[in-house]
């Protein structure tokens, strides 16, 4: 058993049917010695007496809040959370994994050291999250994260809807122009009722870069059905742009066609590469769509920014 | 060329070649679900690789003040990787295909390093560690680690040359 925070303890339990359970000693935080009784929010009536209560924890009924009393007065509380281990593997039941088998998905719109991580939950009830740097070595990268919040968007996976939580983090000391040598290491602690789980991830900022879409997409008619389409770097992208350059993929989106956000890199079927912020295209109907990607490192591409082929005269 | 005494390199040529290096580095190791070898332990294999760090003057301000520090660091890295790609790690089994991106990458690393340092002028270079894995799968894991590290290195170098070409070219 170890202390998660004041008066909250995590008990690591072997979740196999014939496991003996974990023996836990709870001590009442009081100078009193006599006439102390114990209750649990999971069971009826008095469950023990004495300054120290010894219990065997093997199921969720054994978790929860234990309170010691004397003569009708509450002396102290101890809250027990269970961390399940089955066949040597820690449980991962609170979060739902994304398509690529990861539980935490982090993205950065630029190289400033600011990034957002998100995760999906199976059931949005009685949840508490805490995300922090998981590496304690002196040369590790320190990160400060805010509070996790529930996103408005729901995510559908395998025909089921999941709630999405997000958190913003910022690396304490950043050097956007350097080559990263140590990854950022994060741990997410998740609590649901009396269950405790932890999840970890490790990444370089360069690998989680996902630019925002190009902005100010505009059309200028040329001859026949040729148009010049132009755009600008997104405001959130790192500067100067002569140093932090983007490349762009341009695609004609036919009417009724949906633009897919793929997991397999930007160079989608039918898209062509442009390094400037304008190009000429043949555009008869539908939309012209543009997405951005770091010019020199193949991290994720932005969402598509689209503009109708019709040119307002 | 970054000639002795610190005159400017051919920024535009360096920009073009470093951008080609980025493309080749990704063709050499695309980082997708094909990497099916069980993940290796973090053995000390590519720790001696020269990295472009914060104090190396490779940021826009540092390049404006004196690009030589940064160019020297880039040159050092190019030579280091060029030697690694020419070592047993890449020449051993499984052997490289004749027209492979890795082969072109090796040649381009040499090409860019020569653009930065003409004959007769020598910047200090770093020794490459003597790594000679006996098993092909160990060699493959090392290749992947080296190429992944090279992708990050050439991305920073390409940014430096792109910025130099845009702002420091005479």
């Amino acid at each position: 058993m170890w202390e998660l925070e004041k008066d909250v303890y995590v008990v690591e339990v072997d979740w196999t049917p014939d496991a003996p359970g974990e023996t836990v000693n709870l001590t009442c935080d009081t100078p009193e010695e006599d006439d102390i009784t114990w209750t649990s929010d999971q069971r009826h009536g008095v469950i023990g007496s004495g300054k120290t209560l010894t219990i065997t924890v093997k199921e969720f009924l054994d978790a929860g809040q234990y309170t010691c009393h004397k003569g009708g007065e509450t002396l102290s509380h101890s809250h027990l959370l269970l961390h399940k281990k089955e066949n040597g593997i820690w449980s991962t039941e609170i979060l739902k994994n994304f398509k690529n088998k990861t539980f935490l998905k982090c993205e950065a719109p630029n190289y400033s050291g600011r990034f957002t991580c998100s995760w999906l939950v199976q059931r949005n009830m009685d949840l508490k999250f805490n995300i922090k740097s998981s590496s304690s070595s002196p040369d590790s990268r320190a990160v400060t994260c805010g509070m996790a919040s529930l996103s408005a968007e729901k995510v559908t996976l395998d025909q089921r809807d999941y709630e999405k939580y997000s958190v913003s983090c910022q690396e304490d000391v950043t050097c956007p122009t350097a080559e990263e040598t140590l990854p950022i290491e994060l741990a997410l602690e998740a609590r649901q009722q009396n269950k405790y789980e932890n999840y970890s991830t490790s990444f370089f900022i360069r690998d989680i870069i996902k630019p925002d879409p190009p902005k100010n997409l505009q059309m200028k008619p040329l001859k026949n059905s040729q148009v010049e389409v132009s755009w600008e770097y997104p405001d959130s992208w790192s500067t100067p742009h002569s140093y932090f350059s983007l490349k762009f993929f341009v695609r004609i989106q036919r009417k009724k066609e949906k633009m897919k956000e793929t997991e397999e890199g930007c160079n989608q079927k039918g898209a062509f590469l442009v390094e400037k912020t304008s190009t000429e295209v043949q555009c008869k109907g539908g939309n012209v769509c543009v997405q951005a990607q770091d010019r020199y490192y193949n991290s994720s591409c932005s969402k598509w920014a689209c503009v109708p082929c019709r040119v307002r005269s | 060329r970054a000639v002795p005494g610190g005159s400017s390199p051919a920024w535009t040529q360096c920009q073009q070649l470093s951008q080609k290096l980025c493309t080749l580095a990704w063709s050499a190791h695309p980082l997708v679900g094909h990497m099916d070898l069980r993940e290796e332990g973090d053995e000390e294999t590519t720790n001696d690789v020269p990295h472009i760090q914060c104090g190396d003057g490779c940021d826009p301000q540092g390049l404006r003040d004196n690009s030589q520090f940064c160019l020297q660091r880039i040159h050092q890295g190019l030579i280091f990787y060029e030697k690694l790609l020419g070592s047993d790690i890449f020449t051993g089994e499984p052997s490289l295909l004749p027209d492979s991106p890795v082969g072109q990458l090796h040649a381009s690393l040499l090409g860019l390093s020569q653009l930065l340092q003409p004959e007769g002028h020598h910047w200090e270079t770093q020794q490459i560690p003597s790594l000679s894995p006996s098993q092909p799968w160990q060699r493959l894991l090392l290749r992947f680690k080296i190429l992944r590290s090279l992708q990050a290195f050439v991305a920073v170098a390409a940014r430096v040359f792109a910025h130099g070409a845009a702002t420091l070219s005479p």
Partner: antibody, heavy 120, light 107 residues
């Protein structure tokens, strides 16, 4: 994830041609090559040849040399294998597999196979 | 071309038994030998690459050894689901070649 999806089964007459497609997804097509392997009913595996999607280079096995053409269409991330002058011993399941373009490697990802039957 | 000869061609075994399949190359191929498993009406699946390197997702009872011309695939404690054909494959030089296969039947 990486997937190779092949075209459906074909029935052909001797002397005809067949063109099997292999549509890839989940990775950057031009960073890999495609090998073609076939398997006659109840028989073992036979390598037919390979094509690099990176530079279009091909290498064909001796048994099908002169009758086979392997191509790629990078705009649709699809590889094709055309076999001409079909004979009854070309009846087989044809598989496409991903091929490393940097060094000779194992075949880690396979298509589901396309049954080609040559019969008069 | 390099000829790969597998033995045995066929083997009938009981569950929990240890199975050994060998593959001999007509000339030296270093460690560029790979093993595949093929179940009826399925595509082959990579089990071992470069003679001895295990693949993620493949049960640890499958192991490989050898180099040069003689190679072995070992299945420790055979399970019913291991009934399949097993092929060796060399990628040392073109044309790539496969062994003729070993069919494993569970008694």
């Amino acid at each position: 994830q990486v997937q190779l999806v092949q075209s459906g089964a074909e029935v052909k007459k001797p002397g005809a041609s067949v063109k099997v497609s292999c549509k890839t997804s989940g990775y950057t097509f031009t960073y890999y090559g495609i090998s073609w392997v076939r398997q006659a009913p109840g028989q073992g595996l036979e390598w037919m040849g390979l094509i690099s999607a990176y530079n279009g280079n091909t290498n064909y096995g001796q048994k099908v040399q002169g009758r086979v053409t392997m191509t790629t269409d990078t705009s649709t991330s699809t590889a094709y294998m055309e076999l001409r002058s079909l004979r009854s011993d070309d009846t087989a399941v044809y598989y496409c597999v991903t091929e490393n373009i940097n060094w000779r490697d194992a075949f880690d990802i396979w298509g589901q196979g396309t049954m080609v039957t040559v019969s008069s | 071309e390099i000829v790969l000869t597998q033995s045995p061609d066929f083997q009938s075994v009981t569950p929990k038994e240890k199975v050994t399949i060998t593959c001999r190359a007509s000339q030296t191929i270093g460690s560029s030998l790979h093993w595949y498993q093929q179940k009826p009406d399925q595509s082959p699946k990579l089990l071992i690459k470069y003679a001895s390197q295990s693949i993620s997702g493949v049960p640890s009872r499958f192991s490989g050894s050898g180099s040069g011309t003689d190679f072995t695939l070992t299945i420790n404690s055979l399970e019913a689901e291991d009934a399949a054909a097993y092929y060796c494959h060399q990628s040392s030089s073109l044309p790539y070649t496969f062994g003729q296969g070993t069919k494993l039947e569970i008694k």
